[in-house]
Structure formats: C-alpha cells, structure tokens
C-alpha cells in the first residue's frame, strides 16, 4: 500500500505563438481544479478499467479574473497535493491523465459550469520511495508543469511497496546498516544500494548496484539532463576552432516524437510537431478515448469517428456538456440578470436581485446617480448598481471631494523624484534613466532601451 502524490507547479500558456486567451474574464471569473487518473502501464492494449490505480480531484483554486488586455498568465492554483492512495503493489510503470478543469463563477446561477481546459497524459517508469520526478506536458497552447512521486505507507517498503518491514521493539540482532523485516523478525534486509555515485535525485534502482534514470535524465549515473547540448566533450586547448571532438547524441536522435511527430531541436531540449489528433511533449497523447473514462456523472461513452472527436459522452438526464460535467436544472438557462440568484419554486422560477437591481429578471439597473452630485467637476457613472464618481484630475474619493496626491503611489521608477503639478505629476529621473516614469535605462552609447515598436 502507498500513495501517489502529484504536485502541480504551474498551468499557463506554453511557449511559442498562439498563446491562449485567459480562460477567465471580468464577466466570467473562474477558478481551476485538477483531476488525476492513474492506470497500470502494462501495455497499450490492456483492457484496464478507467483509473484502475485510482483517481483524485484537487481542491478549487483561488478565483481568478482576467485583467483586460493582459496576456494569459500562469493561473492561480489550488493548494496542496493530489494524493491517490493505492492498495496493492505499485506497478513501477504507470499511465497518468491529468485534467485541468475550469469552474465558471459568473452568472452560472444553476450551479457552477465546468469545462475541461486541457488534458495531458503519459506513461512513466517510477519506483516507489524515489525522489520527486519533474515533468512538463503541453496540451494545445497550454503548458502544465508538475512533479510526482510514489511513496509507500508503513509498514510497506521497497520499490513496489510489497515488502513489509516493521521496526523491532527489542534491540535489533541485525548487523549495522541492516533492517529487520516482517514476516520473519530474525530475517535481516540490507537496504537497497544503488551503483556508487548514482544520482539520488535523478536515479533509482530496483536491484542492488544498478542505476536507472528518471524521465529527462541520462548517463551511467543519471547526472546528465537529456536537454544538454550535443557536445559531450570539448576540443582540447590546442584546437583553435570551437566545436565538438565527438558529436554527442542530439536530443532528436532516435526521434523521441511518437505517432509520426517530427522533432526539432530547441536551445534547451527538443520540440515535437504532432500530427492531427495527437499532442503532448512527445505526441504520445492521442485524442482522449473512452478508455480514459472522460464522461462524468454516469455518462455513456461512445467512440467518435475521427481523431478530433475521439469520444462522445451521452449524458444522463440532468447533465450536459461534452463530458456530462454540467448539472442541468431549470435555472441553468440563467433567467436572472446582473448577478441575480435564480430560485426554482417548483411552479416557476424567481430571481433574487443584487442590491441596485430590480425587476422580475433583475433587468432594471436602479439609477444610483439620480440626485447624486460629484464634486470638483467629477461625473457620475452608473454600473453594477453602485454610484461611482469619475473624478477630474487632481481629485479623488467617493464624491471627488478629496484632493488627490498624484505622487502617493510612488510612480517614478529607479529612484526618480516625483513632483505634484497642476496637470498631474512630473518625474525627475536619476542619472542613467529617462521616460515619463523614469522607466527606461539610458545606455552608455546614448541609446535608450526603449521597447520595440
């Protein structure tokens, strides 16, 4: 018995062109959660039930609202690990599916709407008890960075968590460095000793004296990242030219891209260009199939006809969405506007409106500007049911009655000094900097590091 642990480090746009738009917006704030599904990695044809090793769902992450005009950043993540307990032996080779789900929190009054943002999958070799293995997977334009490990729960030990060792209450009769092991208390087990020098972070062993490498590492002692440059040994000092004495294996040697993907070297590693219907770091993920168990809430999975729709979920009553992930009730059509709460009274629906709104569907925005004055030339702005003043330059506060200090926010960068001025503010820049906010360094040759047009 033991636990598979998954730590998500980041989920955001991958490198390269075609960065995805943020999945959340000001109108539809959302939060992420993750689902992991584990299967023993026996063979591609193994008719395993979906998630035969187990599955886990993360907590919901923090609510995120897109800043208008900003590129999609790495999105805020749920706290904690995803833990998948396993009862039997750890198989050593396993398949994983990690899904990133979006929970929309806007006007989804009939309960939140869920949609699948990205799904990554892979097959890995992993010994229980080893260190955290790091991985990066891409799904379309998204990139997921994560670490995982398998650890045994006492009294289980070993790379498969199949041996039971218990600490002895009596002083050990075993020699130094040996541990007593159940079932026979007088049987002593030597801790597994890998090949001398085998990297404790990137290598592991299942037999004494061996050194097997985790994903992304190579070399006899698993100390060489797969992404190192093609030069294994530099030329001697007598050589005037730079280059390689013996060309080492390039990252694309042997084509790591599966399913007909084409490999191209990148400064740090390699990149696979995948054919239609495949994705993942090595094009190892085909369009998800019914074997992956993609249908929630008892949906019936039917294989699709083409690679772009590898499955179709037939949802039971009360659920819809491509994965039957959305609960459907009579409030699901969102009859209430402006954030009103939909209530199903049985015979009909009713809307409970937020402050500042009225009407059967909360459609009327109560004019909070009526009879309200904004001082010092400010103008009243309606919206969200709240009265807000847009103040003239130099004034602030709810009713524009406060004189604003434009320097309060310390707007001048790199030690520039701020001076309040009738038209706003002026920055006096420190030597070596220029710009309205002293944001650009001036290079010695006189050119400033202005952003490219």
């Amino acid at each position: 018995a033991g636990v598979f642990e998954l730590q998500i480090h980041s989920f955001g746009p991958g490198p390269g062109p075609g960065a995805p738009r943020s999945p959340c917006s000001a109108r539809l704030p959302c939060r992420l959660f993750f689902r992991v599904c584990l299967k023993p990695g026996l063979s591609e044809e193994a008719a395993e039930s979906p998630c035969a090793l187990g599955a886990a769902l993360s907590a919901r992450g923090p609510v995120y609202t897109e800043q208008p005009g900003a590129p999609a950043p790495d999105l805020p993540l749920p706290d904690g690990l995803l833990q998948v307990p396993f009862r039997d032996a750890w198989p050593g080779t396993f398949s994983f599916i990690i899904e990133t789900w979006r929970e929309e929190l806007g006007d989804q009054i009939g309960g939140p709407a869920w949609s699948l943002l990205a799904r990554v999958a892979g097959r890995r070799r992993l010994a229980a008890g080893g260190p955290w293995a790091r991985d990066i997977q891409r799904a379309g334009a998204w990139e997921l960075r994560f670490s995982y490990r398998a650890r045994c729960e006492p009294p289980a030990v070993g790379t498969a968590c199949t041996r039971l060792c218990r600490p002895r209450s009596a002083p050990s009769r075993c020699g130094p460095g040996l541990r007593p092991c159940a079932p026979l208390e007088d049987e002593c087990e030597a801790p597994l000793v890998c090949r001398a020098g085998c990297s404790p972070e990137h290598g592991f062993c299942e037999q004494p004296g061996e050194c097997r490498c985790l994903e992304g590492w190579t070399g006899p002692l698993c100390t060489v990242p797969v992404s190192t440059s093609s030069c294994l040994s530099p030329r001697g000092p007598s050589s005037a030219t730079t280059g390689c004495l013996v060309p080492g294996p390039g990252p694309c040697d042997g084509n790591p891209c599966a399913n007909g993907g084409s490999c191209s070297e990148t400064p740090r590693s390699f990149e696979c260009t995948c054919p239609r219907g495949f994705y993942g770091l090595r094009c190892e993920v085909s369009g998800v199939t019914c074997a992956d168990g993609p249908c929630f809430n008892g949906g019936l999975c039917v294989g699709g006809a083409d690679p772009d729709s590898a499955y179709i979920c037939h949802c039971p009553p009360g659920f819809q969405g491509s994965n039957c992930e959305k609960r459907v009730d009579r409030c699901s059509l969102q009859p209430c506007r402006n954030g009103g709460l939909c209530l199903d009274l049985g015979h009909a629906l009713r809307c409970r409106c937020r402050a500042g709104f009225a009407g059967p569907r909360c459609e009327h925005d109560l004019d909070d500007c009526a009879g309200r004055a904004c001082a010092n030339g400010g103008t009243c702005v309606e919206g969200g049911g709240a009265h807000r003043c847009s103040c003239a330059l130099g004034f602030g506060g709810r009713d524009c009655r406060e004189r604003a200090d434009p320097c309060a926010a310390r707007p001048c960068a790199h030690g520039g000094r701020c001076y309040a001025h009738f038209s706003g503010l002026v920055c006096a820049c420190a030597p070596g900097y220029m710009g309205a906010r002293c944001e650009f360094p001036v290079h010695p040759d006189g050119a400033s590091a202005l952003p490219a047009a």
Partner: antibody, heavy 120, light 107 residues
Framework: EVQLVQSGSELKKPGASVKVSCKAS????????MNWVKQAPGQGLEWMGI????????IYNHKFKGRFALSVDKSSNTAYLQISSLKAEDTAVYYC?????????????WGQGTTVTVSS | DIQMTQSPSSLSASVGDRVTITCHAS??????MGWLQQKPGKAPKGLIY???NLEDGVPSRFSGSGSGADYTLTISSLQPEDFADYYC?????????FGGGTKVEIK
C-alpha cells in the same frame, strides 16, 4: 400582437446544411426563451432544445446533440435552428415556440412551422 | 427523461359530448405541464399551462386538472372546431417531453 414568423420550406440533399429562422415581434424578445420542436411526417412532437436569447445559453435534448445548433440575433429579434450533415430522417416540420423565461407560462405562442425535406 | 403517457391515442365523439384525455408522467412534475391543440397542417396552440390555467383566448369549455404525475384535459361540450390532435407536455425537467397525442375525431 405576438407573432413568430418562420422561414419558408427547404428542400435539401443529404449532407447539406439548413438554417431555419424564427422572427419574433409583439413582445420583448429577451424576456422569453425560444424552444424548437420537431414533428416528423405523421408523428408526434419532439422537443429539440431551448435558448435564452438574452445570454445565448442553450440546452439541448441529448437526441439532438452534435448536428443541431440554436442561436439568436438580438438586433433582429430572430432565433435560428441550424442542422448540418442532413439525413433523410431530418425530414420534418420544425417549430419555434416561445416560453416565459421565469416559466410562469408554457409554450404559449408557436411559429407556423418550416418544412425541411431531405432527399437525394 | 420523463415519459409522458397519454391516453387514449384516439377517440370518436359527437358535438356536445364531454371528452376527457389523461396524461401520466413517469415521475411527479408538480403541475409543470401544459396541453396543446394541433389542427391538421397547422402549428400547435397552447390551451392550458401549469396543469390547470387557461391560456389567453381559450374557451372556458376547456379545463385542466391534476397533480403529481397524473393530469386530465376535459372538454365539457365538444364543438366542431375542437376536432384535432391534443398533446400534453412537461416542462418540469430538461429535456421537455410530449405525450404521444390523442386524435379526437367526429363520430
């Protein structure tokens, strides 16, 4: 006077697409959902789906998932039913029917129907 | 999906007769149902909503009753213009479902 006026009959070949329109007048378009109902020759009524014209949110009968799409154009008070990859069994009369969005009423007003014939 | 079982599927009656059509839902629908009338070659027309309420302009000889899963449409005195097909529909839960219809013919 409340009226739902649908587009005219269509004769299409298998594999083609069709877009049926339903123009609403005489009421506030966004205050009522629009239902779409199929009636095959000599058969009863079958509910296809519903759309909220205000938000564009749709719910489909699972039997009509995939090739069928509901949409609206609020500027012209028009609801649409699009059917792609037409099959012979799509031959039917298609009706739009409005329903109060707070479900205080049932499908009270119906369009006159649009006959779609799929034949090679 | 909620099944709506309508009976009879057809009936013959004379002008002035009292006619009753029933509809049984496969689960309770709390009155979220209506009755529709459809004449040959025409669109359906709403008669009753919420099980018992008459739509605007519908003659008072039509009435609806029932609760839970069982509902009845009654025409107290059949008129010549009432010969048509009648359908029940539930809107308690998506997908909405219709009964199979009842054809009311002249005897």
């Amino acid at each position: 006077e409340v009226q739902l006026v649908q587009s005219g009959s269509e004769l299409k070949k298998p594999g083609a697409s069709v877009k049926v329109s339903c123009k609403a007048s005489g009421y506030t378009f966004t205050d009522y959902y629009m239902n779409w109902v199929k009636q095959a020759p000599g058969q009863g009524l079958e509910w296809m789906g519903i759309i909220n014209p205000y938000s564009g949110v749709t719910i489909y009968n699972h039997k009509f998932k995939g090739r069928f799409a509901l949409s609206v154009d609020k500027s012209s008070n028009t609801a649409y039913l699009q059917i792609s990859s037409l099959k012979a069994e799509d031959t039917a009369v298609y009706y739009c029917a409005r329903q109060d969005s707070l479900l205080d009423y049932a499908m009270d007003y119906w369009g006159q129907g649009t006959t779609v014939t799929v034949s090679s | 999906d909620i099944q709506m079982t309508q009976s009879p599927s057809s009936l013959s009656a004379s002008v002035g007769d009292r006619v009753t059509i029933t509809c049984h839902a496969s689960q309770g629908i709390s009155g979220n149902m209506g009755w529709l009338q459809q004449k040959p070659g025409k669109a359906p027309k709403g008669l009753i909503y919420h099980g018992a309420n008459l739509e605007d302009g519908v003659p008072s000889r039509f009435s609806g009753s029932g609760s839970g899963a069982d509902y009845t449409l009654t025409i107290s005195s059949l008129q010549p213009e009432d010969f048509a097909d009648y359908y029940c529909v539930q809107y308690a839960q998506f997908p909405y479902t219709f009964g199979g219809g009842t054809k009311v013919e002249i005897k």
